[in-house]
């Protein structure tokens, strides 16, 4: 039975040219996390595998940084980065948990996001 829940940063916004941390946290389960995939719509950004380390999709390699932890740092943001992001947790023995984050990249300096996940 899957008892876990995914906590995410929810809806966040950031400035064009800036950086943002995408973060999910799996709680309420003792299941072992074997792999976390980060996807934007159907596009793979990165994979963090417990045994193999990080795989960053070649098209994002220059502006996606692994971490912190199982999170993902997006750099040099553009308005095209606006959209839904998904963290997909493969766990044993529970199975798969999915979390959703909506990122809005703003042109001006009106972007506000939680300080806990912001890169100065």
């Amino acid at each position: 039975m899957m008892t876990g829940t995914i906590e995410t940063t929810g809806n966040i916004s950031a400035e064009k040219g800036g950086s943002i941390i995408l973060q999910c946290h799996l709680s309420s389960t003792t299941a072992q996390v074997t792999q976390v995939n980060w996807e934007q719509q159907d596009q793979l950004l990165a994979i963090c595998n417990a045994d193999l380390g990080w795989h960053i999709s070649p098209s994002f390699k220059d502006r996606v940084a692994p971490g912190p932890g199982l999170g993902l740092t997006l750099q040099s943001l553009t308005v095209n980065d606006t959209g839904e992001y998904f963290c997909i947790y493969h766990t044993y023995p529970d199975g798969t948990y999915t979390g959703r984050i909506f990122l809005e990249v703003l042109e001006s300096s009106v972007a506000e996001h939680g300080a806990r996940f912001q890169i100065p």
């Epitope: 595998n49 045994d51 193999l52 070649p58 098209s59 390699k61």
Partner: antibody, heavy 119, light 107 residues
Framework: EVQLQQSGPELVKPGASMKMSCKAS????????MHWVKQKPGQGLEWIGY????????KYNEKFKGKATLTSDKSSSIAYMELSSLTSEDSAVFYC????????????WGAGTTVTVSS | DIQMTQSPASLSASVGETVTFTCRTN??????LTWYQQKQGKSPQVLVY???TLAEGVPSRFSGSGSGTQFSLKINSLQPEDFGSYFC?????????FGAGTKLELK
């Protein structure tokens, strides 16, 4: 066209070390990891490990730790594998293979380097 | 280590026939499975990755299916160039491992 050009065959003596190369062309070298795979004559495939030229990070199959050392040179787009303390068990074809864009599979392979260990 | 079991070990078929290879794992690997073709004296070539995604340039007569622990590769209407060995490989943990292969021969 994406190509991986591997160095030529090697005849080496037991106990010696050797280093083979894999020159990449037709793509941005630092955007993809490079894997190495062993195949003994008429047998299956064994993954040795990978090197990420972007940050020089590497991961090894536990079986090949201490046997294989993976390095790369960004400036020349060449990946290297050094094999040490060679024995007849190391006689095989060794392939370099580019990592796939969606994970740890192999989307382009070199032609292979044949290593023969014999006295 | 994740064990990969391929069957059959060898298979004889004729041009125009349809064949199916299977690959079984001893633990759940979701859809993280790749199929390769290797001809005698040549390097392997990727056919299908993530269990069902056809690699670039691979003819549509090839198709992959399955998830979890059971996977298959199907070739419709065999062509002369399809004869050779086929390997599966998981990409869900260290070490990455391959099946022992299926040798497809001309009947």
């Amino acid at each position: 066209e994406v190509q991986l050009q591997q160095s030529g065959p090697e005849l080496v003596k037991p106990g010696a070390s050797m280093k083979m190369s894999c020159k990449a062309s037709g793509y941005k070298f630092t955007s993809y990891v490079m894997h190495w795979v062993k195949q003994k004559p008429g047998q299956g495939l064994e993954w040795i490990g990978y090197i990420d030229p972007y940050n020089d990070g590497s991961k090894y199959n536990e079986k090949f730790k201490g046997k294989a050392t993976l390095t790369s040179d960004k400036s020349s787009s060449i990946a290297y594998m050094e094999l040490s303390s060679l024995t007849s068990e190391d006689s095989a074809v060794f392939y370099c293979a580019r990592g796939g864009s969606r994970g740890w599979y192999f989307d382009v392979w070199g032609a292979g380097t044949t290593v023969t260990v014999s006295s | 280590d994740i064990q990969m079991t391929q069957s059959p070990a060898s298979l004889s078929a004729s041009v125009g026939e349809t064949v199916t290879f299977t690959c079984r794992t001893n633990e759940n690997i979701y859809s993280y499975l790749t199929w390769y073709q290797q001809k005698q004296g040549k390097s392997p070539q990727v056919l299908v990755y993530n269990a069902k995604t056809l690699a670039e340039g691979v003819p549509s007569r090839f198709s992959g299916s399955g998830s979890g622990t059971q996977f298959s590769l199907k070739i419709n209407s065999l062509q002369p160039e399809d004869f050779g060995s086929y390997f599966c490989q998981h990409h869900f943990g260290n070490p990455l491992t391959f099946g022992a292969g299926t040798k497809l021969e001309l009947k």
